[in-house]
Interface confidence: medium
């Protein structure tokens, strides 16, 4: 006896009703009463509904079933379920009994819509661009587990720092929770996508952070758009200026310098008077320009340590701030060049060449070359060690084999100062001693 | 109307760089990202990278990120794709494309007319 | 990355004959963009956001999903319709497209 059921699974809502279709081909003269149905669990055997005997023996599976009676003598053995749960999921199995018998298998894949996302946002009182923000993207009582994407504002990938939790309640349906941990620009919008992977239904909200740069009408910042260069043991100015209205006075300002990612104040001016430095005695305001808007920093004694962003926060009756970078340099001293072996050298032999070239910051880049200029890539190795001031000691070593002569040049370049200082040798074709004798 | 519109056709040596310029008229620049396609001949399409002309922010295909630079200058909206160290692979058409939508949804709406480079040595 | 792979590579079909294109991709996408290209002519927006139809474009394209499989239907083409149409997606970085499909009239 052929049994026919649909192929696909049959996807039916959380508290709809459900059809599960089955059929068969009736002979002539057929009647229920040689009709033997039985509708099971696949997996379980467990019995879900019944045609025996000529009569329908009703739902064993919670009292959520029904055959199609008036159907039954055209071989449609369907059965319906209602109010459809999340636990219903899976395979049932159709068997039909005349003389022969035949059977076949449905499934059911339930799904439940995730209901549009609700956006939090967590501080969510005066952020700043550079603050750290958690956004959350809750979709809650869906089915099955949910796929879930970020973007921002271009429509780009936010694939950073997410972390998507998913609990099923006692029903079987899914909250799920989305973090995003992301760093405010000036402004930006975030979005979160919540799919559902049966229904290819996506539900998605979005928030828009814009944050505080200032109320209106408040204080204008203005610091430089480019970092500060300044080098090892020099002073550095930090500009910040604002402009006064008419009738400012220096009792009404408040200026507080800070470094913009540990908060650690640096230097104030507040009540009428200067606070003083609060970091390691080396900043300085420029006090008799105060009143005419200038609001800079003076920091003595650069160090490498100083390197990063202050912040500049002027309050008088409205506020406004800025952060200015500060990047720290120090020159490469000229390098010294030194050859092993360096007695008797002949062409065919390997030489190794070092270039080493001191206290310098930040990190050197190092380039070797022929005396015709062309770059020596070849076997070179570099390294370069940090001592307790932060300054950089950087050693290149250049293995090659001696041409009848030849000049061999390290190039030793700050990429901040864009400073080069380089060194050479020349290695003539005799027999020769490093460094030549007198 | 919005449009890209690209410089001209380039012929260049294995080694050498090249640079495309795009163009952009009639929407506010700085409102979307630039992002640059190249197409070899015959071939499919290949994402090179883009470029926020408000933000100046990019982002590179790591096939091409050691050779690509990619700038905007705001005050001609005028988008630029520098490719160095040139090879024979390289010769395409190379195409930008305006990325517009609304959030969450995002799509190539606008593109330039596209700039042949052809490395032959 | 996340791979697009088209199928077929290359189909020629009558006029009024039913097409379908498939973009399968290597995992999740939160949607997908498709694109018509013809011969020496740059890429034109056909299908944004996984179903919407850009603008000019006939009703007789479809999208539907399955899973990972994104299959574009036309409905019963037309000699305008033949083209190269490729599959964009930028879930996650790079930006990729499928390798394409050219589709012939006979």
């Known amino acids: 006896l052929e049994v026919q059921v649909p192929e696909d699974p049959v996807v039916a809502l959380v508290g709809t009703d459900a059809t599960l279709r089955c059929s068969f081909s009736p002979e002539p003269g057929f009647s229920l009463a040689q009709l033997n149905l039985i509708w099971q669990l696949t997996d379980t055997k467990q019995l879900v509904h019944s045609f025996t005997e000529g009569r329908d023996q009703g739902s064993a599976y919670a009292n959520r079933t029904a055959l199609f009676l008036d159907l039954l003598a055209q071989g449609n053995a369907s059965l319906r379920l209602q109010r459809v749960r999340v636990a219903d999921e899976g395979s049932f199995t159709c068997f039909v009994s005349i003389r022969d018998f035949g059977s076949a298998a449905v499934s059911l894949q339930v799904a439940a819509p995730y209901s549009k996302p609700s956006m939090t946002l967590e501080p969510n009182k005066d952020l700043r661009p550079g603050d750290t923000v958690t956004i959350t993207c809750s979709s809650y009582r869906g089915y099955p587990e949910a796929e879930v994407f970020w973007q921002d504002g271009q429509g780009a990938p936010l694939t950073g720092n997410v972390t998507t939790s998913q609990m099923a309640n006692e029903q079987g349906l899914f909250d799920v929770h989305s973090v995003l941990r992301v760093v405010l620009g000036a402004n930006g919008t975030y979005s979160c996508l919540v799919r559902n992977p049966v229904l290819q239904q996506d539900a998605h909200g979005s928030i828009t952070i814009t944050p505080q740069r200032s109320p209106t009408g408040a204080v204008e910042v203005q610091v430089p758009e480019d970092p500060v260069v300044a080098l090892v043991g020099t002073d550095a100015t930090l500009r910040c200026s604002f402009s006064p209205e008419p009738g400012f006075s220096l009792a009404q300002l408040n200026l507080i310098w800070q470094l913009t990612d540990t908060k650690q104040l640096v230097h104030s001016f507040t009540e009428g008077r200067d606070q003083g430095s609060a970091y390691a005695n080396r900043t300085a305001l420029f006090l008799d320009l105060l009143a005419q808007g200038n609001a800079s920093l003076r920091l003595q004694r650069v160090r490498v340590a100083d390197e990063g962003s202050f912040t500049c926060f002027v309050s008088i009756r409205d506020f406004g701030s800025a952060a200015v970078s500060l990047q720290v340099a120090a020159p490469y001293s000229k390098p010294s060049m030194t050859l092993e072996p360096n007695k008797d050298l002949r062409p065919g032999d390997t030489v190794t060449i070092t270039c080493s070239s001191y206290r310098g910051y930040p990190e050197a880049e190092v380039f070797w070359q022929d005396g015709q200029g062309a770059p020596l890539t070849g076997n070179v190795t570099t390294s370069q060690m940090a001592n307790e001031q932060g300054l950089f000691d950087v050693h290149s070593v250049l293995r090659v084999v001696l041409g009848a002569n030849g000049t061999y040049s390290c190039l030793v370049r700050n990429p901040v100062l864009q400073q080069d200082a380089h060194g050479s040798v020349t290695i003539t074709g005799q027999p020769m001693t490093f460094p030549p004798e007198a | 109307e919005v449009q890209l519109v690209q410089s001209g056709a380039e012929v260049k040596k294995p080694g050498s760089s090249v640079k495309v310029s795009c163009k952009a008229s009639g929407y506010s620049f700085t409102s979307y990202t630039i992002h640059w396609v190249r197409q070899a001949p015959g071939q499919g399409l290949e994402w090179i990278g883009y470029?926020?002309?408000?933000?100046?922010?990019?982002d590179y295909n790591q096939k091409f990120k050691d050779r690509t630079t990619l700038t905007a200058d705001r005050s001609t909206s005028t988008a630029y794709m520098e490719l160095s160290s040139l090879r024979s692979e390289d010769t395409a058409v190379y195409y930008c494309a305006r990325y517009s939508g609304s959030t969450p949804y995002w799509y190539f709406d606008v593109w330039g007319q596209g700039t042949t480079v052809t490395v032959s040595s | 990355e996340i791979v697009l792979t088209q199928s077929p590579d290359f189909q020629s079909v009558t006029p009024k004959e039913k097409v379908t294109i498939t973009c399968r991709a290597s995992?999740?996408?939160?949607?997908m963009n498709w694109y018509q290209q013809k011969p020496d002519q740059s890429p034109k927006p056909w299908i944004y956001?996984?179903?919407n139809l850009a603008s000019g474009v006939p009703s007789r394209f479809s999208v539907s999903v399955s899973g990972t499989d994104h299959t574009l239907t036309i409905n019963s083409l037309e000699a305008e319709d033949a083209a190269t149409y490729y599959c964009?997606?930028?879930?996650?970085?790079?930006?990729?497209f499928g390798q394409g499909t050219k589709l012939e009239i006979k």
């Open positions: 470029i926020n002309p408000n933000s100046r922010n990019t």
């Open positions: 956001a996984t179903s």
């Open positions: 964009q997606q930028w879930s996650s970085n790079p930006l990729t």
């Open positions: 995992s999740s996408v939160s949607y």
